[in-house]
């Protein structure tokens, strides 16, 4: 059986939309599937790599690599999106390409970044971990670390940094899929909102879905002990 909840929820474009949340009900009247997984149920994607989920994550990453920061022209906020999802009239899509990107580093002026920009994250304004020396962030935003400390400056002069961020990664469903969403939407969908991250590639949703002990490698499920837990 399914339990359907409908509610007006603030979405990425800054407007309230009617959203449906469909929850698979437990036939035996008990915990939801997500709770059962957290409690240690035999759920194969937590035990070993699931090809379907792996494909989903790779597809999400490929899309994210081509994303940019969509900044609303009325200064109401910004969100990481695909170009097609960013209004040409009401917003500015900040995406580095050709010669418009910053150099990889002050030591390498010739090599320009083509992957990015990312709303609220920039190698030029992140103090920790700093993009310098042997630790220059790669020209692939899906390989960027989470910035734990921004440079202490109110404004940077960069559109994608000085805007109010409206969405962050949200882990939704037992499949461990990730979307950049508002906190409100994420909570309504019973997802896990990652306040600390800017990109889906920085979070490991399946690790969150599975719970229990974190995977040794966040990309590789290894909870073989589930076979004995349940």
């Amino acid at each position: 059986a399914q339990h359907v909840t409908t509610q007006l929820v603030l979405r990425n474009k800054g407007v309230y939309e009617s959203v449906k949340y469909i929850q698979q009900e437990n036939f035996w009247i008990g915990p939801s599937s997500i709770d059962l997984i957290h409690l240690g149920a035999k759920f194969s994607p937590c035990i070993r790599k699931d090809q379907q989920i792996e494909q989903l994550v790779l597809r999400e990453r490929d899309l994210e690599r081509d994303s940019g920061c969509c900044v609303q022209n009325d200064h109401s906020g910004c969100i990481q999106t695909q170009r097609k999802d960013c209004s040409e009239t009401l917003a500015t899509f900040v995406k580095w390409q050709d010669d418009t990107g910053p150099p990889m580093d002050k030591s390498d002026l010739g090599q320009k970044r083509t992957s990015g920009a990312v709303c609220h994250q920039d190698p030029r304004t992140c103090e920790e971990p700093a993009s310098s020396g042997a630790h220059i962030w790669p020209d692939d935003i899906t390989k960027w670390p989470i910035c734990t400390e921004q440079a202490k400056s109110n404004r940077t002069g960069f559109l994608h940094m000085d805007c109010q961020i409206k969405g962050r990664p949200c882990c939704i469903s037992t499949k461990g899929s990730c979307e950049i969403t508002t906190r409100e939407y994420c909570e309504f969908m019973h997802g896990y909102f990652h306040e600390e991250a800017t990109l889906c590639s920085q979070v490991h949703c399946l690790d969150k879905v599975c719970g229990l002990l974190p995977f040794l490698n966040p990309e590789v499920p290894d909870q073989f002990y589930r076979l004995w837990l349940s």
């Epitope: 150099p103 002050k106 030591s107 010739g110 304004t125 103090e127 310098s132 940077t156 002069g157 960069f158």
Partner: antibody, heavy 123, light 106 residues
Amino acid sequence: QVALKESGPGILQPSQTLSLTCSFSGFSLSTFGMGVGWIRQSSGKGLEWLANIWWDDDKYYNPALKSRLTISKDASKNQAFLKIANVDTADTATYYCARIGNYGSNYWYFDVWGTGTTVTVSS
Amino acid sequence: QIVLTQSPAIMSASPGERVTMTCSANSRISYMYWYQQKPGSSPRLLIYDTSNLASGVPVRFSGSGSGTSYSLTISRMEAEDAATYNCQQWSSYPLTFGAGTKLELK
């Protein structure tokens, strides 16, 4: 209010080492992203970039002069220094230090300059 | 190294006149930076990233260009604009400046 001021010996003889100091206020060279550059201008000639130093102690030099240049800083005293070894008359110029900014820029720029110090190399 | 060639070397303009000067690079660069220098003074940043006005710079100044060809335009010349204008590149080391365009008041 950002301000920079250069100081130097005024006059020195060929083969000596020129030591320049840039004292600044309104920013700190220990702040992430900050940098200071040295640029000189010979009488009636254009501007010539010499060297940059950054908050993380990264240093970049003009290769044409690299063997003679040494840039350094004392962030606690808000000072940057430039030494030019084995000077000759061609090094006679006005020497400027400038803060490196990048507000809103994909690269960087010299956004605030000192007043300059005139150096004459003469025997 | 990247060589920047400014032209003309010297020019004059009457108040209210439109002024355009150019800076060409011997190889492709990403952005151009422009500085104004008056006699006895230090250079002042006018334009960064080819077309962005630095803080406090009057809107009569504008910059444009791409690749190897860039220009600085003053829409209506004013007496206080008489100065030498230098272009600069930050696309590769060594950082280089143009020799300057001296703008005189007619």
